[in-house]
Interface confidence: medium
């Protein structure tokens, strides 16, 4: 019926998901750059992965337009609080997109992490967790930026991490 | 043409998504060992339910391999600060293969809850949320463990529980 | 062979997910009504959308049964804690149906966030994120409750959401 | 089964020290909390602190503090507790005990048999 | 510091009768659902043994006659029927927060 060959096509697909895009990015000693910018990522090695998104400077991107859950978990740390640090750590996903010259905030989160050492100890930790859909067009990006990006520990990919899929 | 069953099976699967393996497991009473062990969750009483994946021992194991997104929180909670309590809690999904020999980290988060007692009331809550996309071949098992185990609370199954669906 | 627009229909869907159910609804000044209610949301500016759900008054509405990830988050702030503060503040995830007189617990999460404040800064800034798999029936809704309310910070629709996609 | 045996009892002279064991059997000591508690002749109990043997670390009723120092030795499995600058008032059975494991219901489900410490000039 | 107060000091029962002892917390003891106040049994010449965990746990290899109710600051033990071996000195005890404190104690004796 000269359906054949995609039809078998779309069963592959419906039973393997082999193309809805998905991405894990981990965090890498490289992340941290100190310059302004977004923390960049590990694409490849470990758990990391890209399926129909690319990645570019910090940025996942789409290749396909649609909705997609991206979310993002930052591990933060420290021993008392930097000199300088705001009462505020801003964990952030934003969006660049050819339509405006500016990043869009898409999902935010202050936190307050050096109120958490104990009294026994200085030493504090905090984990910033985001997660939510938004649409993105073919060539859009998306990127964390973490303001005091001084506090984010990296370690060994498991604890700082950037991801999406499509819905 | 040929294709008449599958094809109607196609369509309800399209629509009804009934074949996407998912799952989210519940906190319980049988939930904190204290063997050393991963948390134990319930399966099929009130919100808990598995589909297309199985559990054992603690663990969620793929019968379908593919990219799932795992997801798990727990609930911390305490009156003041328990004995021998190091100042972080870990909270993390871990993998299980017959490729390796150990446990292999996937998504981990480290707290210090213990600091966020008021200076009013020694009670504090707080609460550790992972999520992200991993593979799975079949087989695979993916486990929640948190040290100490011994600040999670469980109550009723909506404050710490643990999950996946495949993306 | 009698497929054709149907077909063409499920290439389609394949391909762009479009009959998906998915859901991203963002804070706004009329989300806190201080009534006892829950939380109320944006469903159509900025980065708000419905596709395949409806909303009434809060509430995210199924129109397809089925397994749903269902997820908030709400950013929490202050100067200090407020008179009367609990030392405890409620996030969760509620479900209304027909069959129940009462709402149901799905997703809960406890915190103390007020224990953050510094020691050289009586602000202090908290996140608290829920996600999880649950089952929706047609007609029946998911709503976000906040205990205490007053420390809901909304700003831009970025910091404070609700969402959902069918799994 | 679990049990906990305290050494002998003991005399000691006004200002002077004592050094209390508990050796532990029958659990995974470094697991639970040990407990120490004394009673007064004819008196109520008096919860003077507590040792984790996973990690040494300690609490102590404010009471005691400076003057009680608890301690645990993993290889022996024994738990002991010094009290210094004795006075006769710290005349006292003590009493050393297993907390629960899920600290925040700290209740005390075995208990050592007991070491009298009597403080004379 | 939690205070603890039992009622009565002493109380006279007979045999085969029911015991009521109370205890009062000077503040709650109530955490997440639970309620942290435990039960202990006292001979002469013997160390405590617990009987009641968390307010109405019963300890295990305890007789089903001995019953724990209460929530918040005021707390009951109940022996539904005396036997002679229950005759002792019994506290209650606080674990919501250290230092962890005892009642006074309450003397259960044979009327």
């Known amino acids: 019926d000269g359906h054949g060959g995609s039809w078998e096509q779309l069963i592959q697909e419906r039973r393997s998901h082999q193309n809805n895009p998905a991405a894990h990015l981990t965090g890498a000693n490289s992340s941290l750059t100190g310059s302004g910018g977004p923390l960049l990522w590990e694409t490849q090695l470990g758990l990391a992965f890209l399926r129909g998104l690319d990645y570019h400077d910090g940025a996942l991107v789409a290749n396909k337009a649609g909705y997609y859950y991206i979310y993002s978990k930052v591990q933060l740390g420290g021993v008392g609080c930097p000199l300088g640090l705001a009462s505020t750590i801003t964990h952030g996903l934003y969006k660049r997109t050819p339509r405006y010259p500016e990043e869009l905030e898409l999902l935010v989160s202050q936190q307050s992490p050096c109120g958490r050492a104990t009294s026994n100890s200085r030493v504090w930790w905090d984990s910033s967790f985001l997660g939510g859909v938004v649409h993105l067009e073919v060539g859009e990006e998306v990127v964390v930026r973490v303001l005091d990006e001084r506090l984010v520990r990296l370690r060994d990919g498991t604890r700082s991490y950037f991801g999406a899929f499509m819905v | 043409d040929g294709h008449g069953g599958s094809w109607e099976q196609l369509i309800q699967e399209r629509r009804s998504h009934q074949n996407n393996p998912a799952a989210h497991l519940t906190g319980a009473n049988s939930s904190l060992t204290g063997s050393g062990g991963p948390l134990l969750w319930e399966t099929q009483l009130g919100l808990a339910f598995l589909r297309g994946l199985d559990y054992h021992d603690g663990a969620l194991v793929a019968n379908k391999a593919g990219y799932y997104y795992i997801y798990s929180k727990v609930q911390l909670g305490g009156v003041g600060c328990p004995l021998g309590l190091a100042s972080t809690i870990t909270h993390g999904l871990y993998k299980r293969t017959p490729r390796y020999p150990e446990e292999l980290e996937l998504l981990v988060s480290q707290q210090s809850p213990c600091g966020r007692a008021t200076s009013n009331s020694r009670v504090w809550w707080d609460s550790s949320f992972l999520g992200g996309v991993v593979h799975l071949e079949v087989g695979e098992e993916v486990v929640v463990r948190v040290l100490d185990e011994r600040l999670v609370r469980l109550r009723d199954g909506t404050r710490s529980y643990f999950g996946a669906f495949m993306v | 062979d009698g497929h054709g627009g149907s077909w063409e229909q499920l290439i389609q869907e394949r391909r762009s997910h479009q009959n998906n159910p998915a859901a991203h609804l963002t804070g706004a000044n009329s989300s806190l009504t201080g009534s006892g209610g829950p939380l109320l949301w944006e469903t159509q500016l900025g980065l708000a959308f419905l596709r395949g759900l409806d909303y009434h008054d809060g509430a995210l509405v199924a129109n397809k049964a089925g397994y749903y990830y269902i997820y908030s988050k709400v950013q929490l702030g202050g100067v200090g804690c407020p008179l009367g503060l609990a030392s405890t503040i409620t996030h969760g995830l509620y479900k209304r149906t027909p069959r129940y007189p009462e709402e149901l617990e799905l997703l809960v999460s406890q915190q103390s966030p007020c224990g953050r404040a510094t020691s050289n800064s009586r602000v202090w800034w908290d996140s608290s994120f829920l996600g999880g798999v649950v089952h929706l029936e047609v007609g029946e809704e998911v709503v976000v409750r906040v205990l205490d309310e007053r420390l809901v910070r909304l700003r831009d629709g970025t910091r404070s959401y609700f969402g959902a996609f069918m799994v | 089964q679990v049990q906990l045996v305290q050494s002998g009892a003991e005399v000691k002279k006004p200002g002077a020290s004592v050094k209390v064991s508990c050796k532990a059997s029958?659990?995974?000591?470094?697991?639970?909390?040990v407990h120490w508690v004394r009673q007064a002749p004819g008196q109520g109990l008096e919860w003077i602190g507590a040792?984790?043997?996973?990690?040494?670390?300690?609490s102590y009723n404010q009471k005691f503090k400076g003057r009680a120092t608890l301690t645990a030795d993993k290889s022996t499995s024994t738990a002991y507790m010094e009290l210094s600058s004795l006075r006769s008032e710290d005349t006292a059975v003590y009493y050393c005990?297993?907390?629960?494991?899920?600290?925040?219901?700290?209740?005390?489900?075995?208990w050592g048999q007991g070491t009298l410490v009597t403080v004379s000039s | 510091e939690i205070v603890m107060t039992q009622s009565p000091a002493t109380l006279s029962v007979s045999p085969g009768e029911r015991a009521t002892l109370s205890c009062k917390a000077s503040?709650?003891?109530?955490?997440?659902?639970?309620?942290?106040m435990n039960w202990y049994q006292q001979k002469p010449g013997q160390a405590p043994r617990l009987l009641i965990y968390?307010?109405?746990n019963l300890e295990s290899g305890i007789p089903a006659r001995f019953s724990g109710s209460g929530s918040g600051t005021e707390f009951t033990l109940t022996i539904s029927s005396l036997q002679s071996e229950d005759f002792a000195v019994y506290y209650c005890?606080?674990?919501?927060?250290?230092?962890?404190?005892f009642g006074q104690g309450t003397k259960l004796e044979i009327k």
């Open positions: 005990a297993r907390g629960s494991y899920y600290y925040t219901s700290s209740y005390f489900d075995h």
């Open positions: 029958g659990y995974t000591f470094t697991s639970y909390n």
């Open positions: 005890q606080q674990s919501y927060e250290d230092p962890f404190t």
């Open positions: 968390t307010a109405s």
């Open positions: 040792v984790y043997p996973g990690n040494g670390d300690t």
């Open positions: 503040q709650s003891v109530d955490f997440d659902g639970d309620s942290y």
